[in-house]
């Protein structure tokens, strides 16, 4: 689970092991601090869960790339 | 494609323990999330519990808790599901089901243990 | 937890017409941010594991025959086999995937009269 120090700065500390399914994931955000230890992506699921996910990992780009696609609106 | 292929039929006397397992195969099984379902003859489907990823844990049914333990050999790729204080209403159909990267649902199933309680 | 109703218990259609399976949910399974309700629909036929029919309510799964359809959002959804077949006799289960304990519904069998 993330873990917020000094607000407003969450940092990473462990990954999840597991995938978890693109169809419970709501949203994620970058961590990209340099007051935290590693870079991050943290997701959101459907149930308000905050996850901390390796953004190295092919699958951990997959969601990122799917919920990209998700949000996207038409240009117009 | 994730296919399970589950352990044979067991008897037991109750008050015994039961292991059944689960091979994977198609996946590794520290991708998947591994649950297992259970189904009393002629009764529906019962979830027992199983790994949760978003809490990076197994989790167990209520009714279950204490009485179950599922664990998992990731260098065989293979998951374990003990019932122990076995009793005549234990006496069911067991399920691996798991869902992959792509579905949050049990899309994939084993072919189910049939456990048998009796004296 | 979540508790999943359905209704009928059981019900015998002839060949050919319409059978409708309602599934009820104690609670919303429905992520209104992207309008989809996490609700799946199994077929088990006698000595079979169960097969996925419907995801998110109503997308049916690949390879399953448009006679199946689902419908609903939130906390009531419906099963329809449009034109009932032989090989559609089975009980059919509905459960919810939106939150843990996952919970199934105490399923419904389809006979043909």
């Known amino acids: 689970q993330p873990d917020a120090i000094n607000a407003p700065v969450t940092c990473c500390y462990n990954f999840t092991n597991r995938k978890i399914s693109v169809q419970r994931l709501a949203s994620y955000r970058r961590i990209t601090s340099s007051k935290c230890p590693k870079e991050a992506v943290i997701f959101k699921t459907i149930v308000a869960k905050e996850i901390c996910a390796d953004p190295k990992q092919k699958w951990v780009q997959d969601s990122m790339d799917h919920l990209d696609k998700q949000t996207q609106t038409p240009k117009t | 494609q994730v296919q399970l292929v589950q352990s044979g039929a067991e008897v037991k006397k109750p008050g015994a323990s039961v292991k059944v397992s689960c091979k994977v195969s198609?996946?590794?099984?520290?991708?998947?999330?591994m649950h297992w379902v259970r189904q009393a003859p002629g009764k529906g489907l019962e979830w027992m519990g199983g790994?949760?990823?978003?809490?990076?844990?197994?989790i167990y049914a209520q009714k279950f808790q204490g009485r179950v333990t599922m664990t998992e050999d990731t260098s065989t790729d293979t998951a374990f599901m003990e019932l122990s204080s076995l009793r005549s209403e234990d006496t069911a159909v067991y399920y691996c089901?798991?869902?992959?990267?792509?579905?949050?649902?049990?899309?994939?199933w084993g072919q189910g243990t049939l456990v048998t309680v009796s004296s | 937890d979540i508790v999943m109703t359905q209704s009928p218990d059981s019900l015998a259609v002839s060949l050919g017409e319409r059978a409708t399976i309602n599934c009820k949910s104690s609670?919303?399974?429905?992520?209104?941010?992207?309008?989809?309700?996490?609700l799946v629909w199994y077929q088990q036929k006698p000595g079979q594991p169960p097969k996925v029919l419907i995801y998110?309510?109503?997308i049916r799964e690949s390879g399953v025959p448009d006679r199946f359809s689902g419908s609903g959002s939130g906390t009531d959804f419906t099963l329809t086999i449009s034109s009932l077949q032989a090989e559609d006799v089975a009980v059919y289960y509905c459960?919810?995937?939106?939150?843990?304990?996952?919970?199934f519904g105490q399923g419904t069998k389809v006979e043909i009269k």
């Open positions: 998110w309510a109503s």
């Open positions: 089901a798991t869902h992959d990267f792509w579905s949050g649902y049990f899309h994939y």
């Open positions: 790994f949760d990823p978003e809490d990076d844990e197994t």
């Open positions: 459960q919810q995937y939106y939150t843990s304990p996952w919970t």
């Open positions: 609670q919303s399974v429905l992520y209104s941010s992207d309008n989809k309700s996490y």
């Open positions: 198609g996946y590794t099984l520290s991708e998947l999330s």
